[in-house]
């Protein structure tokens, strides 16, 4: 990780932690993530079809950044959501959300990020996902678009 | 710290933690930081020539905010990077990055922030730095521009 | 919490933690927050008249997001501050701040978020608040506007 092999974790250091990075072959929602290569972390949490799956109830800090950009600004409304799904509950629950409207000058090349991060009480089997409104406007570089969490 | 003297840390509270604030005498990259006065924190981590030096391998939440502003908008592309350097590896590794283009109306006074934050597995002797594309457009107020981390 | 009842906390899990969400009946500064319903968390920290009251000295990660939006852009300067007040000290201390100027196209419907998050050494009896420059431009949806912290 981060340019050098991950050290063997000490017994106590089995932190519940994830840091997933942008995956450019995302074709639909929710976004899909790189869970293996590069600066990725995945420990004590599972990754499944775009989602982080909680396996231990508790308090988690959850974060995501999405990098939007385009060749020619037309000010399409942008949204970036972190939401939760659990088979026990019928509806997705939006945990955090960012929206942008009127953010660039018409016709110009543009770029902008949305960052979200907060603490939530999550339950075993909760699935966390990231959704964006305009997939074609997302740049998936690992340093620019990411999704992560850690158990407090 | 924060307007009152820091309490004597309990033995167990020797957290690896840093919160450095903007230093207006930064003249080149990487940015330099205030590591002594004001709302600064530095414990179990060293500060050296703009960088935070890790001395214990493990998981860290790393964050930075940069406040860009200008008297007269000309939409110069802005970038804000947190990157890592280690003598064992030839190249800097960009951990997180934010970019902005076409973000203000030509001619107007403008102001905008970039925020980055995520979890990384860092190794002893890693050096972490912050880079921006346009130094002259950064305001270094301690509440506006900062760089920090803590060990999970 | 988050669509399902909070599990009975284990003894050790009495984390000092808060996540408060936007409350649309805020009429003046500081902002007021929802501390009871929805995805709210409040444990080992008190909520009083818009403020989070620290009752144990130590290191805390503090964060806030505010979602600004308007029907017709006139580029009023926007500011978002997290500040601290303690009866022992005469003046509020601004811990983190975000400002925006020239952020939308005149006359257009617009939307933009400000995110802040960092580590601070807080002392028992410190009161933390959030201030914004233009209350009428804040949208208080729980996923969009929030204020939280946790003890490291």
């Amino acid at each position: 990780q981060i340019g050098h092999p991950s050290p063997p974790p000490e017994k106590k250091e089995l932190r519940k932690v994830a840091h997933l990075t942008g995956k450019s072959n995302s074709r639909s929602m929710p976004l899909e993530w790189e869970d293996t290569y590069g600066i990725v972390l995945l420990s004590g949490v599972k990754y499944k079809k775009g989602g982080l799956v909680i396996n231990e109830t508790g308090l988690y800090f959850v974060y995501s950044k999405v990098y939007f950009r385009g060749q020619s600004c037309n000010n399409l409304p942008l949204s970036h959501k972190v939401y939760m799904r659990n088979s026990k509950y019928p509806q997705d629950l939006v945990m955090m959300e960012g929206k942008m409207m009127s953010y660039c000058t018409t016709g110009q090349m543009w770029a902008r990020s949305s960052y979200l991060g907060a603490v939530f009480n999550l339950t075993s089997a909760d699935h966390l996902y990231v959704n964006v409104s305009e997939l074609s406007l997302v740049n998936f570089e690992e340093s620019q678009t990411f999704f992560g969490l850690y158990k407090l | 710290q924060i307007g009152h003297p820091s309490p004597p840390p309990e033995k167990k509270e020797l957290r690896k933690v840093a919160h450095l604030t903007g230093k207006s005498n930064s003249r080149s990259m990487p940015l330099e930081w205030e590591d002594t006065y004001g709302i600064v924190l530095l414990s179990g981590v060293k500060y050296k020539k703009g960088g935070l030096v890790i001395n214990e391998t493990g998981l860290y939440f790393v964050y930075s905010k940069v406040y860009f502003r200008g008297q007269s908008c000309n939409n110069l592309p802005l970038s804000h990077k947190v990157y890592m350097r280690n003598s064992k590896y030839p190249q800097d590794l960009v951990m997180m990055e934010g970019k902005m283009m076409s973000y203000c109306t030509t001619g107007q006074m403008w102001a905008r922030s970039s925020y980055l934050g995520a979890v990384f597995n860092l190794t002893s002797a890693d050096h972490l730095y912050v880079n921006v594309s346009e130094l002259s457009l950064v305001n270094f107020e301690e509440s506006q521009t900062f760089f920090g981390l803590y060990k999970l | 919490q988050i669509g399902h009842p909070s599990p009975p906390p284990e003894k050790k899990e009495l984390r000092k933690v808060a996540h408060l969400t936007g409350k649309s009946n805020s009429r003046s500064m500081p902002l007021e927050w929802e501390d009871t319903y929805g995805i709210v968390l409040l444990s080992g920290v008190k909520y009083k008249k818009g403020g989070l009251v620290i009752n144990e000295t130590g290191l805390y990660f503090v964060y806030s997001k505010v979602y600004f939006r308007g029907q017709s852009c006139n580029n009023l300067p926007l500011s978002h501050k997290v500040y601290m007040r303690n009866s022992k000290y005469p003046q509020d201390l601004v811990m983190m701040e975000g400002k925006m100027m020239s952020y939308c196209t005149t006359g257009q419907m617009w939307a933009r978020s400000s995110y802040l998050g960092a580590v601070f050494n807080l002392t028992s009896a410190d009161h933390l608040y959030v201030n914004v420059s233009e209350l009428s431009l804040v949208n208080f949806e729980e996923s969009q506007t929030f204020f939280g912290l946790y003890k490291l």
Partner: antibody, heavy 119, light 106 residues
Framework: QVQLVESGGGVVQPGRSLRLSCAAS????????IHWVRQAPGKGLEWVAV????????FYADSVKGRFTISRDNSKDTLYLEMNSLRAEDTAMYYC????????????WGQGTLVTVSS | DIQMTQSPSTLSASVGDRVTITCRAS??????LAWYQQKPGKAPKFLIY???SLESGVPSRFSGSGSGTEFTLTISSLQPDDFATYYC????????FGQGTRLEIK
């Protein structure tokens, strides 16, 4: 009505200092950027400096950078210009002017205060 | 820096005349141009912004036009009160003024 009234001008020797003030009334001072603009005798207008509505940011013309400091006290509705290391070429009428909507143009001007730098 | 050049430097005209003052920018400034009027011993007065928008309270005989690098201030029918010096100012990139055009009685 909007009013800006400058004061503090006078005759000063080269290398010395002077502090100008601009008292504002008739508008919410703390929500406007304010500029200093000067005019040498018989010459055109030259922009000098600006301070943002909340005092957080200040910008200067190259000709005065490092010598002049703009500041404001929003509790007193007053703008200041601290002028150090004055030179003969700083001789001018100094106007404070209110910025329109952060656009770097000026909708209201004071009547000016004359600064003469001469030995 | 963007240079602003006004022409003519001096203009002689009579009451009732239609007069035009030109302002040229050394590079394109879109429409980010303002005009001011200044009388001897007085502060400048704001007339026009964004090249053609008339400030409220300014008589409608004043008008502005142009974009890019060439701009004009026109007074459709000169009144005695209009004899003064006129300045253009660009705010596309920082702030620079033209050298001024003195409008005098013929």
């Amino acid at each position: 009505q909007v009013q800006l009234v400058e004061s503090g001008g006078g005759v000063v020797q080269p290398g010395r200092s002077l502090r100008l003030s601009c008292a504002a009334s008739g508008f919410t001072f703390s929500t406007y950027g304010i500029h200093w603009v000067r005019q040498a005798p018989g010459k055109g207008l030259e922009w000098v400096a600006v301070i943002w509505y909340d005092g957080s940011d200040k910008f200067y013309a190259d000709s005065v950078k490092g010598r002049f400091t703009i500041s404001r006290d929003n509790s007193k509705d007053t703008l200041y210009l601290e002028m150090n290391s004055l030179r003969a070429e700083d001789t001018a009428m100094y106007y404070c002017a209110r910025d329109r909507d952060n656009w770097n143009y000026f909708d209201y001007w004071g009547q000016g205060t004359l600064v003469t730098v001469s030995s | 820096d963007i240079q602003m050049t006004q022409s003519p430097s001096t203009l002689s005209a009579s009451v009732g005349d239609r007069v035009t003052i030109t302002c040229r920018a050394s590079q394109s400034i879109s429409s980010w141009l303002a005009w001011y009027q200044q009388k001897p011993g007085k502060a400048p007065k704001f007339l026009i912004y964004q090249a053609s928008s008339l400030e409220s309270g300014v008589p409608s005989r004043f008008s502005g036009s142009g974009s890019g690098t060439e701009f004009t201030l026109t007074i459709s029918s000169l009144q005695p009160d209009d004899f003064a010096t006129y300045y253009c100012q660009q705010y596309n990139s920082y702030i620079t003024f033209g050298q001024g055009t003195r409008l005098e009685i013929k």
